[in-house]
Each structure stands twice: as structure tokens, then as C-alpha cells.
């Protein structure tokens, strides 16, 4: 027997090794792939080392016995049955409000006779439910509001923002959802001032004449 | 306003590869939930969806015709393309791109006539 | 896929008549979240078709009143309550529940 060649490897079973070179020396790499419905457990790649012993013990070709995760579907939320999606696992996808479920609400994990298991439908979609605009809403005074247009596609977001000096009350974003007709998802905000000073130094007013009006807001406080 | 415009060859051989453009505005595919088809009128088939478009680039395909067909879109151009490969006299037709939200096609182009012929 | 059955395949009127165009699905359209994605769509001469009837028995923006839509599971109906001139054209029914979607062959509309 040579001595200068790694031992023969052994094929496994419900999988195939490749090449299948006559040759070990030092530096040869063996790939172990499994059958269709099997996966490799341990390193696919195994390498004929100086010291003529392989880099990795041997694999093997386990059954795949769950679907991949068939991902989350924007607009939606999701049910499932059992974390790994093991066969007959379910999801269930339900589209937010304003959206419409195009394709299969459920799918179901199915086991094949060759291969891996099978999802029972390609994820969904959720949909527009309809392309009416929301009309523009007016910034808030002492605020802006971006963008400026009178008219939102429906599932357009507009942003608040307040002067300096300015504090927003409410969302800094609403949106507009999406229905019959479409609406804003909240009230617009209002920029409340961030503090009785800051109310009269952004008007440039001078507190000092107007004493009376201040001592009313000193006795107030 | 929402409008379509389709555009294509108008006469092609058999065996030949069709390509379609939609051009449109009024909307934007950019909006998240917002798709875009193609629909072709037949003497044979009558009305048949062909393909969407999402969005998100997802595409999907009517099955029967699913080997031949290649959908794709140009979202910054505000257009959307139709690739049909091996074109027969069966594919003469109408051609029509439509907006799809809600489930239906609300807003349709003007159709793009094709004629197979040798 | 689901087969949309029209009748009938031909119409013929007088202008200020009724009309009643059927439609039935192969299967139920009923969709997961509880509607019927049932549309109606008219394609006049020389044109596009249009939408004229969504959900069943929603009116489209710009549709007439004299168009409505009902019907439900398998079985629909779209009814013309006085047919004017402009109303003659070929009528398809749509389902969007199920995808592939699916058109009936048409009904057309014309003049007796």
C-alpha cells in the first residue's frame, strides 16, 4: 500500500462524494453533495492534509424534515403555526388596513417524495386596496411640513418639524392610508412653543417693556 | 390623472421575440403596493392577463405562458417592459398595460396591435 | 385557473331598455379577507376597456348610476337600467380573488 496518499474515502449513504480521483495526495479536495430531500450535516469539503489524514471528519446526509422560511410580506403581518416550519406547518399572512392580499393567504408546508419539503404556494402580496390621493394638509404655524404638494399618493408619509424655539405635539409623520376614499392616519401636529420666553424672544419682543404683562406671567407661573 | 401608453413593433415573423414599452404617469411605481400588468386581447382567448410587476421588482406570471415571458421596469422613467419570445400567429393581439391595485385594473392604456405574419 | 362564464354571448336591445348580463365562476371568488374581487369592464369600439364595477356592486369614479353590480359565491349580475347609445360596447366580468386573474369572454351589447 502507498504511503503517501490520505485513506480512501467511504461514499455515504443518500449522498455522492466528488471527484473520485484515484489519486490522495496531499492537497486533494473531496465535496460531499446529498440526494435531493437530504442536506449535509458536518463539512461538504474535506482536504488531504500534509500529515495524510483528512482536514474533517466525515459527513453525513440528514432528511430535511421543514421548508425554509418563506419571509415576511410588506404590508402584512404573520401567523405561524410552528417556528422551524416543520411539514404541515402553516402561515398565515393578513394585510394591513388600506392593503388586499394578492395570491395565497395560507401556506402550508408539504412533504415530497423526492426533495425537500415544498411550501404549497409562492408568498403573497399586499396590494394598494386603492390609488385615491389624501389631500395636502396645512404645516403647522411655527412649522413646515415636507413634502409641499396639495395632493399624497395613498401610502405616501409626510414629515413635521417646528421652528426653533418650537416643540411638535403629535405624530411627526402621518400617513396617508389607503381606503375608500384614502385618509390621513392621524391628526397633522401643532408646534407648541418650548417655553414662555422662547414664546416672546422668537417674536423679538422686549419682556422688559412690557412690565405689567410680565409680572401677570410671573403671578401665572 | 392617471394615464398609459403602450408601444411596440406592430408586425413581427413567427418565431420572432416581441417587446413591449408602457409608458405612463399619474402615479409612480415607487409607491409601496402599487403594480402594473400586462393584458392582451386575442380573437381565440378573449381577454388574458399576461403579467404584474410590483413595486419591489417582485414579478409574477401568467403560468400558461410563463416560459416565453419577461416583465421588467424602469421606475425612474415611469416605465415598464414586456418581453414575449417565440411569438406564433396565436400571439396576434391587442396588447394592453394597466394599472392593478384593489385587485383590479383601473386605469388601461390605449393598446399596442400586434400582427403575426409570415 | 377559474373559468368566468358570460351569458349571453350577444345582447340585442332597444335604447331605453333594461339589460341583464350574467356571469358565473367555475369556483367561489370569495377572497380570504372576506370580499368578492368581482369586477365588470366595457370595451367600446375602437377603445380600451374600461372599469365600470368593482367589488361586486361599486360604482367606479365617473360610472353612471344606471350601471349595478350584484351577485355572490359563483353567481353575478350586471344590470343597465335604462341603455343609452354610448352604453354599447362588449362587457367582460373579472374575478381578481384568485390568481391567475381571470376575464369572462364577453357579452355584447347592441342595438335591436
Known amino acids: 500500500p502507498r504511503n503517501d496518499t490520505c485513506p480512501e474515502l467511504p461514499e455515504i449513504p443518500n449522498g455522492w462524494k466528488s471527484p473520485s480521483q484515484p489519486e490522495l495526495v496531499h492537497g486533494t479536495v473531496v465535496t460531499y453533495q446529498c440526494y435531493p430531500g437530504y442536506q449535509v450535516v458536518g463539512s461538504s469539503v474535506l482536504m488531504c492534509q500534509w500529515d495524510l489524514t483528512w482536514s474533517e471528519d466525515l459527513p453525513s446526509c440528514q432528511r430535511v424534515t421543514s421548508c425554509h422560511d418563506p419571509g415576511d410580506v410588506e404590508h402584512s403581518r404573520r401567523l405561524i403555526s410552528s417556528p422551524k416550519f416543520p411539514v404541515g406547518a402553516t402561515v398565515q399572512y393578513i394585510c394591513d388596513q388600506g392593503f388586499v392580499l394578492m395570491g395565497s393567504s395560507i401556506l402550508t408546508c408539504h412533504d415530497r417524495q423526492a426533495g425537500s419539503p415544498k411550501w404549497s404556494d409562492r408568498a403573497p402580496k399586499c396590494l394598494l386596496e386603492q390609488l385615491k390621493p389624501c389631500h395636502g394638509l396645512s404645516a403647522p404655524e411655527n412649522g413646515a411640513r415636507s413634502p409641499e404638494k396639495q395632493l399624497h399618493p395613498a401610502g405616501a408619509t409626510i414629515h413635521f418639524s417646528c421652528a426653533p424655539g418650537y416643540v411638535l405635539k403629535g405624530q411627526a409623520s402621518i400617513k396617508c392610508v389607503p381606503g375608500h376614499p384614502s385618509h390621513w392616519s392621524d391628526p397633522p401636529p401643532i408646534c407648541r412653543a418650548a417655553s414662555l420666553d422662547g414664546f416672546y424672544n422668537s417674536r423679538s419682543l422686549d419682556v422688559a417693556k412690557a412690565p405689567a404683562a410680565s409680572s401677570t406671567l410671573d403671578a401665572a407661573h | 390623472q392617471v394615464t398609459l401608453k403602450e408601444s411596440g413593433p406592430g408586425i413581427l415573423q413567427p418565431s420572432q421575440t416581441l417587446s413591449l414599452t408602457c409608458s405612463f404617469s399619474?402615479?409612480?411605481?415607487?409607491?409601496?403596493?402599487?403594480?402594473v400588468s400586462w393584458i392582451r386581447k386575442t380573437s381565440g382567448k378573449g381577454l388574458e392577463w399576461l403579467a404584474h410587476?410590483?413595486?419591489?421588482?417582485?414579478?409574477w406570471y401568467n403560468p400558461s405562458l410563463k416560459s416565453r415571458l419577461t416583465i421588467s421596469k424602469a421606475t425612474s422613467s415611469n416605465q415598464v417592459f414586456l418581453i414575449l419570445t417565440s411569438v406564433d400567429t396565436a400571439d396576434t393581439a391587442t396588447y394592453y398595460c394597466a394599472t392593478f391595485y384593489g385587485l383590479y385594473f383601473a386605469y388601461w392604456g390605449q393598446g399596442t396591435t400586434l400582427t403575426v405574419s409570415s | 385557473d377559474v373559468v368566468m362564464t358570460q351569458s349571453p354571448l350577444s345582447l340585442p336591445v332597444s335604447l331605453g331598455d333594461q339589460a341583464s348580463i350574467s356571469c358565473r365562476s367555475s369556483?367561489?371568488?370569495?377572497?380570504?379577507?372576506?370580499?368578492?374581487?368581482l369586477e365588470w369592464y366595457l370595451q367600446k369600439p375602437g377603445q380600451s376597456p374600461k372599469l365600470l364595477i368593482y367589488k361586486v356592486s361599486n360604482r367606479f369614479s365617473g360610472v353612471p348610476d344606471r350601471f349595478s353590480g350584484s351577485g355572490s359565491g359563483t353567481d353575478f349580475t350586471l344590470k343597465i337600467s335604462r341603455v343609452e347609445a354610448e352604453d354599447l360596447g362588449v362587457y367582460y366580468c373579472f374575478q381578481g380573488s384568485h390568481v391567475p386573474p381571470t376575464f369572462g369572454g364577453g357579452t355584447k351589447l347592441e342595438i335591436k
Open positions: 399619474g402615479f409612480s411605481l415607487s409607491t409601496s403596493g402599487m403594480g
Open positions: 369556483q367561489s371568488i370569495v377572497h380570504s379577507n372576506g370580499n368578492t374581487y
Open positions: 410587476i410590483f413595486w419591489d421588482d417582485d414579478k
